[in-house]
Interface confidence: low
């Protein structure tokens, strides 16, 4: 209630001889600071005096005395909260109780405090979990009600009298609810831990003993066995006798049932600790354990692998991989159920057999056609040879061989022949399903393999085939050599360089671009007359008379072929030149009169001039010369001369008669 | 003399993989079947996996199967155990042990073994 001071501090606090004490506490006084503070040893209140009686341990006051004890004990409290306590070192003769006379200005209080001093270090007490299993992590608590900060201590474990490796937790409480030192320890107890000795150790700062506690560990744990088995190698033949037997080394709780398993799977009627198989045929052959339960689980032995030792069962051959490419690699394996293992193997080859292959693989690194067909092999260990099995078939594909191009056509073949070729291999595997052909044409495949080539071309020189399944094989291309008549025939000038004049040597050269075959002969025409024979048309002095259109031919054994006809042109100065007269050479005067200035030339006269009977030329430059009217006087011998760009040429003399008209007569 | 050399082992991840050798010398190794035993801390030994002399036939642990693969090389006298997806249960000293009886042999029991290798650790963890 509301007259009460209130304190806060542990009920009884616990230390031994020589050891100290440690006393948190807390106070809230009535009114005011604290004046006055005694503490005793077992108090008696006298009714008499109205004060406390006993010893006195120590004491503050306002005047400051303080007794000797005081060294020992230490108040190290404050006025109006804290009365914490310490003693050190502590006596037996310290136990009893405490009493703490507080007095403020108006009120007074006297508070009660347990004090238990044993003569020798109490032991700490070891807490267990209620139950323990094997590898089930547990704690392990060890209490002392025991805490000063001017004493030291440490809690150690111990198993079996060896300190634990694992780490514990120390921890420590010095508060007004609780004052202790605890040591906390994880630990997974495996089941040979059970019935083991747990010790906590309490110590000194030195390590020096002090006192312990002790339990005994009950470990829960599933039965632990060992089997035996007789033979000791669990190898025998078949219609031998096994034995097996199986011990518990431990268990707690005890054992309920027993039971045998082989490969995982209960044994029926096998309940007994020994287990025995009489007449044992291969199929016994397995793992063997024995099954032990209690209340926590089963327990199970090792496992004893029983080797029922038989000749090899009749082999099969495992192929990788078939089908095989031609030139791959491909292994065998022999595999064959045997105990023991075989040792020897002999391998066949399309029921033949393959010399020098023992083992239970054959490698082959480079895979030809003919190791296709059928392989098989026999085991062999100590107890016996096993049978030839069915063996497996090995298909080893390759692309088509020896691939040819065969003309099917009589030779030689002709431009514009129909050609028929076919494409040809040796074997295949798998079979051929197409053709290709090179070069690329508008050509039929009338069937399978064979291509039909309508109008050969002069220039088709060179086809190759290909006969496909997975891949594609060529042939070497073959040749058609087809045979022409001469192609591009034509004249070329060889010389001269320039325009031909003439007089000049001229030679003509008849070219054409190929023939086959190579052998030819030559014809030159003009106007559908035969020349000659040889390549080139030669004129040591050309004549304008040669000019015309030219043709050569050129012939070989197919056909013969003839160029575009080729223009021959000379030039030459104006030649033949006369002056003819129109309407005649006598003329009545007062008539027309025409003289025209006729020539050979070429290139054309491009210029004419006229000259009279004195050699005076006349101002007139065409062609023809026009007299109207005509007069007597122009009777006369007049020529011409034509010019071109080769040079000039002259007529001769022609006279023109002029004679008088009848009127004219008549006058005279 | 005769020697079984293990090496390969080391510190993996759980889920990563290794691959122990085992090289043979001073004896002839092809005539021998080969097996992996390991031996956790504070465990027993306990039977890994078994392979025939020519390498055709192989046996495993239940607890290896599907993760563990072992192979021989007669021409290099050297037994292989390729291990995947390890677990850290698997944590142990592998050792490679070799018999010169002609079939599946299947022990954990050290002298049931004609030769013995002196072991590699191996430590999976995160």
């Known amino acids: 209630d509301s007259s009460k001071w209130v304190f806060e501090h542990p009920e009884t606090l616990y230390a031994w001889e020589g050891a100290c004490v440690w006393i948190p506490c807390t106070y809230r006084a009535l009114d005011g600071d604290l004046e006055s503070f005694i503490l005793f040893h077992n108090p008696e209140y006298n009714k008499n005096t109205s004060k406390f009686d006993g010893t006195r341990l120590y004491e503050s006051t306002k005047d400051g005395k303080v007794p000797s004890e005081q060294k020992r004990v230490q108040f190290l409290g404050d006025k109006n909260k804290n009365c914490t306590l310490s003693i050190h070192p502590v006596h037996l003769n310290d136990s009893g109780q405490l009493g703490l006379r507080m007095e403020s200005k108006t009120e007074k209080w006297m508070e009660r405090i347990h004090l238990n001093v044993s003569e020798r270090p109490f032991p700490p007490h070891i807490q267990l979990p209620p139950e323990i299993q094997e590898s089930q992590e547990v704690t392990l608590t060890c209490l002392l009600n025991f805490s000063c900060y001017g004493y030291p201590i440490q809690l150690q474990w111990l198993l079996e009298g060896v300190p634990m490796r694992q780490a514990a937790v120390t921890s420590t409480s010095l508060t007004i609810k609780s004052v202790f030192t605890r040591s906390e320890l994880k630990f997974s107890p495996q089941w040979s831990h059970h019935g083991k000795i747990v010790t906590c150790q309490l110590q000194d700062a030195d390590g020096k003993f002090l006192s312990n506690d002790t339990v005994q560990l009950n470990v829960k744990h599933t039965p632990k066995l060992e089997i035996k088995v007789t033979p000791s190698d669990a190898i025998v033949r078949e219609g031998d006798s096994v034995t097996m037997t199986c011990e518990v080394s431990s268990s707690n709780p005890e054992y309920t049932t027993v039971s045998w398993l082989k490969d995982g799977t209960s044994l029926k009627k096998q309940n007994t600790f020994t287990l025995n198989l009489r007449e044992v045929t291969k199929d016994q052959s397995g793992k063997y354990c024995c099954q032990v339960s209690n209340d926590v689980g089963p327990g199970r032995s090792e496992e004893v692998f029983l080797q029922v030792q038989y000749a090899p069962e009749p082999s099969t051959v495992q192929i990788l991989h078939s089908p095989a490419v031609e030139g791959s690699q491909v292994e065998f394996l022999c595999m064959s159920l045997a105990n023991p293992l075989p040792t020897n193997y002999t391998w066949y080859h399309n029921g033949k057999e393959m010399q020098g292959r023992t083992e239970e693989k054959v490698h082959i690194p480079k895979i030809l056609p003919w190791h296709a067909g059928t392989y098989s092999c026999v085991a062999e260990n100590i107890l016996g040879t096993g049978q030839r099995g069915p063996g497996a078939e090995l298909d080893v594909q390759y692309p088509p061989k020896k691939v040819t191009t065969v003309i099917q056509n009589p030779m030689p073949i002709r431009e514009g022949d129909t050609v028929t070729l076919s494409c040809n291999y040796n074997s295949s595997n798998p079979s051929v399903t197409r053709y290709e052909w090179k070069p690329h044409g508008a050509w039929e495949e009338p069937s399978l393999g064979v291509l039909k080539i309508q109008n050969v071309g002069w220039d088709n020189t060179t086809i190759a085939c290909a006969a496909c399944n997975s891949w594609c094989s060529w042939a070497s291309p073959v040749a058609l050599n087809v045979q022409y008549a001469p192609r591009d025939v034509r004249v070329r000038k060889i010389k001269p360089l320039s325009e031909i004049h003439s007089g000049n040597s001229v030679s003509l050269q008849c070219d054409f671009s190929s023939s086959h075959p190579k052998e030819v002969q030559f014809f030159w025409e003009k106007n559908g007359r035969l020349l000659g024979k040889e390549s080139q048309l030669n004129f040591d002095s050309i004549s304008p008379e040669d000019a015309g259109s030219y043709s050569c031919w050129v012939n070989n054994s197919i056909g013969q072929t003839a160029s575009k006809a080729w223009t021959l042109e000379v030039l030459y100065a104006p030649r033949r030149l006369r002056v003819s007269m129109s309407p005649g050479d006598q003329v009545m005067e007062g008539k027309s009169a025409t003289l025209t200035c006729e020539s050979d030339a070429n290139p054309p006269v491009s210029h004419y001039t006229w000259f009279d009977w004195n050699n005076q030329s006349l101002p007139y430059h065409s062609q023809k010369l026009r007299l109207e009217p005509v007069k007597v006087q122009h009777s006369g011998a007049y020529w011409c001369q034509g010019t071109n760009s080769v040079g000039k040429g002259r007529s001769p003399l022609s006279t023109l008669t002029v004679y008088y008209s009848p009127e004219t007569i008549g006058r005279r | 003399q005769v020697q079984l050399v293990e090496s390969g082992g080391g510190l993996v991840q759980p889920g990563g993989s290794l691959t122990l050798s085992c090289a043979a010398s001073g004896f002839d190794f092809s005539f021998y079947t080969m097996t992996w035993v390991r031996q956790a801390q504070g465990k027993g030994l306990e039977w890994v996996s078994t392979?025939?002399?020519?390498?055709?036939?192989?046996n495993y642990a239940d607890s290896v199967k599907g993760r563990f693969t072992i192979s021989r090389d007669n021409a290099k006298k050297t037994l292989y155990l390729q291990m995947t997806s390890l677990k850290p249960e698997d944590t142990a000293v592998y050792y490679c042990?070799?018999?010169?009886?002609?079939?599946?042999?299947?022990?954990?029991?050290?002298?049931?073994?004609?030769?013995w290798g002196r072991g590699t650790q191996v430590t999976v963890s995160s």
């Open positions: 392979i025939s002399t020519g390498g055709g036939g192989s």
């Open positions: 042990a070799s018999h010169r009886r002609g079939y599946m042999f299947v022990s954990s029991r050290k002298n049931e073994y004609d030769y």
